[in-house]
Interface confidence: low
């Protein structure tokens, strides 16, 4: 027993021209919900055949009202997982059908109107207990992004949820023929139901209905002591009470078989029985081929020359990974210049430019001064998307409309007097100082030759502009 879980990440218009702006019809607002249907096997079944593995319906999503002027975003979705419980073994191969439905909320006669907006059908292989598998699928003009996984409900474990866990009976290790249950070693696989009458002490089974004997016992029900009662050459301890009943550590301990393979002991070694899709000594090699359609997002599948890879996916632009399952973060290359915001729309990159910049990558600096006038002889200076005026002397402010007093900042040092002048200002220095701002002391042997006031200016009349 277990649960198939589906997480819808986004549903929205697919890339390219003609993508719909809204899932709603002209009749008004709507909301979305999803239906998932699971069918066993990889055969192309008729769409109307029953969802033999189960089905589930999501909650309704938030109400969506189209805003025609806005670019179509990912649509508001219902929260949470879609969960499809399964009672029996997980088949490993299955068909996944996801339907997106629209519920129109306008004034409908007889209540809301439902219509199927999009449907994707994928044939997949998936082991229970594995990580989330991600997928992106197109259905007409729509694009659906989702993840899914199958997980066992305890006490079931394994890639098919057929093995059961139970508390360990013996203190040190699991009973004969039983493996520890991951992840905790104090749990053991519960035994399958053996053949009726199979000795509880001397027999065990790996499959229902069989009866396999421990060392030293024989017969259809493992009731007959074997003629060789010696433990020589056998693994594990022996004693007068237990004989050879308790096997010691063996080659299958810790299960060397990867990817859900099952281990069986052979003389001095082990053998892995691999699940479909894997092979190799330890089931470590993927046997998936191009026929299984392993390349996502339109990747091109070709047979691999590498012996450890039965296929290679050539990914379309914007995707990477061994199965083209990862979207390339093209914005990480920072293609937008001048502080523009990068948006990866899937089919294209778009830069949202800061004020004052334009172009596909915000590379063009707009003329900030176009149509902007600076008064009183000021000149306009471009910069950073905001115009700035460089004002003529005697003027200030954003547009050079304000009169400025050049003496207001007290530019003359050491008590010098400031006089406004049409070309700026002039400092009349106190005795002992010289320089345009009276910043230099006169040398002891020097003489200050600056006039008390320049011709045409009177002290105390700094606001006269000639």
């Amino acid at each position: 027993a277990g649960v198939f879980e589906l997480q819808i990440h986004s549903f929205g218009p697919g890339p390219g021209p003609g993508a719909p702006r809204s899932p709603c019809s002209a009749r008004g607002p709507c909301r979305l919900f999803f239906r998932v249907c699971l069918k066993p096997g990889l055969s192309e079944e008729a769409a109307e055949s029953p969802c033999a593995l189960g089905a589930a319906l999501s909650a309704r999503g938030p109400v969506y009202t189209e805003q025609p002027e806005a670019p179509a975003p990912d649509l508001p979705l219902p929260n949470g997982l879609l969960q499809v419980p399964f009672r029996d073994a997980w088949p490993g191969t299955f068909s996944l059908i996801i339907e997106t439905w629209r519920e129109e909320l306008g004034d409908q006669i007889g209540g809301p109107a439902w219509s199927l907006l999009a449907r994707v059908t994928r044939r997949r292989r998936l082991a229970a207990g594995g990580p989330w598998a991600r997928d992106i699928q197109r259905a007409g003009a729509w694009e659906l992004r989702f993840s899914y996984r199958a997980r066992c409900e305890l006490p079931a474990v394994g890639t098919a949820c057929t093995r059961l866990c139970r508390p360990r009976s013996a203190p040190s290790r699991c009973g004969p023929g039983l493996r520890p249950c991951a992840p905790l070693e104090d749990e053991c696989e519960a035994p399958p139901v053996c053949r009726a009458g199979c000795s509880l002490e001397h027999g065990f089974c790996e499959q229902p209905g069989e009866c396999r004997c421990l060392e030293g016992w024989t017969g259809p029900l493992c009731m007959v002591p074997a003629s060789t009662s010696s433990c020589l050459g056998l693994r594990g301890p022996s004693s007068a009470t237990t004989g050879c009943l308790v096997p010691g550590p063996g080659p299958c301990d810790g299960n060397p078989c990867a990817n859900g393979g099952s281990c069986s002991e052979t003389p001095g070694s082990f053998e892995c029985t691999c699940p479909r899709g894997f092979y190799g000594l330890r089931c470590e090699v993927s046997g998936v081929t191009c026929a299984d359609g392993p390349c996502f997002n339109g990747g091109l599948c070709v047979g691999g020359a590498d012996p450890d890879s039965a296929y290679i996916c050539h990914c379309p632009p914007g995707f990477q990974g061994s199965n083209c399952e990862k979207r390339v973060d093209r914005c990480s290359l920072q293609p937008c210049r001048n502080g523009g915001l990068c948006l990866d729309l899937g089919h294209a990159l778009r830069c949202r430019c800061r004020a004052g910049f334009a172009g596909p990558r915000c590379e063009h600096n707009l003329d900030d001064c176009a149509g902007r006038a600076c008064a009183n002889g000021g000149t306009c200076v471009e910069g950073g998307g905001a115009h700035r005026c460089s004002c003529a002397l005697g003027f200030g402010g954003r547009d050079c409309r304000e009169r400025a007093d050049p003496c207001a900042a007290r530019p003359c040092a050491h008590g010098g007097r400031c006089y406004a002048h049409f070309s700026g200002l002039v400092c009349a220095c106190a005795p002992g100082y010289m320089g345009s701002r009276c910043e230099f002391p006169v040398h002891p042997d020097g003489v200050s030759a600056l006039p008390a006031a320049p011709p045409g200016l009177r002290p105390g009349d700094p606001q006269r502009y000639l």
Partner: antibody, heavy 118, light 108 residues
Framework: QVQLQESGPGLVKPSETLSLTCTVS????????WSWIRQPPGKGLEWIGY???????NYYPSLKSRVTISIDTSKNQFSLKLSSVTAADTAVYYC????????????WGQGTLVTVSS | EIVLTQSPGTLSLSPGERATLSCRAS???????LAWYQQKPGQAPRLLIY???SRATGIPDRFSGSGSGTDFTLTISRLEPEDFAVYYC?????????FGGGTKLEIK
Amino acid sequence: QVQLQESGPGLVKPSETLSLTCTVSGGSISSYYWSWIRQPPGKGLEWIGYIYYSGRTNYYPSLKSRVTISIDTSKNQFSLKLSSVTAADTAVYYCARIAVAGFFFDYWGQGTLVTVSS
Amino acid sequence: EIVLTQSPGTLSLSPGERATLSCRASQSVNKNYLAWYQQKPGQAPRLLIYGASSRATGIPDRFSGSGSGTDFTLTISRLEPEDFAVYYCQQYDRSPLTFGGGTKLEIK
């Protein structure tokens, strides 16, 4: 959102039995493992044991002889009993949910301090 | 049982710095079955990382976990004021479940 709340006496006499209950809200107690963890004052975390909703349990070996964890699915509660307590059992006791992805703890109660003193 | 040893016992750093916390197991932890928790005074622990490197829901990406076998590391790339707390590692490969002794991350 799953929430866990511990309840029980804050003071227990030596040699008596400590009893705590954890009430689970915002989700079903079924299909998960549930655990007790304690933390002596100023020290680290110690796992006490867990219980599955079917009643299956597993305890920390050194506490095994004194610990009983039980579950009541109808009340969405599970409980801890620790017998023959001593001052060394003084600690903040936390109940927690064990995650589906592995035997780690994804939701915790806020903890309750139990002092063993006469 | 698997004994987890955390080092250093106390780590004094300033906000904005990078923190590296170590957790060493007495025997190999299979399948990277190791989790990290953060605990602030008077609060319950909070799950940060599981599977040695997977961030739990809602955990900022400045927290990252790495390592395998017997050596595991929790890294906080750029410390925020709220990150100063005690950090514990926990293995869930084998019973009994065990925690490390903790690393106290304090403001320098």
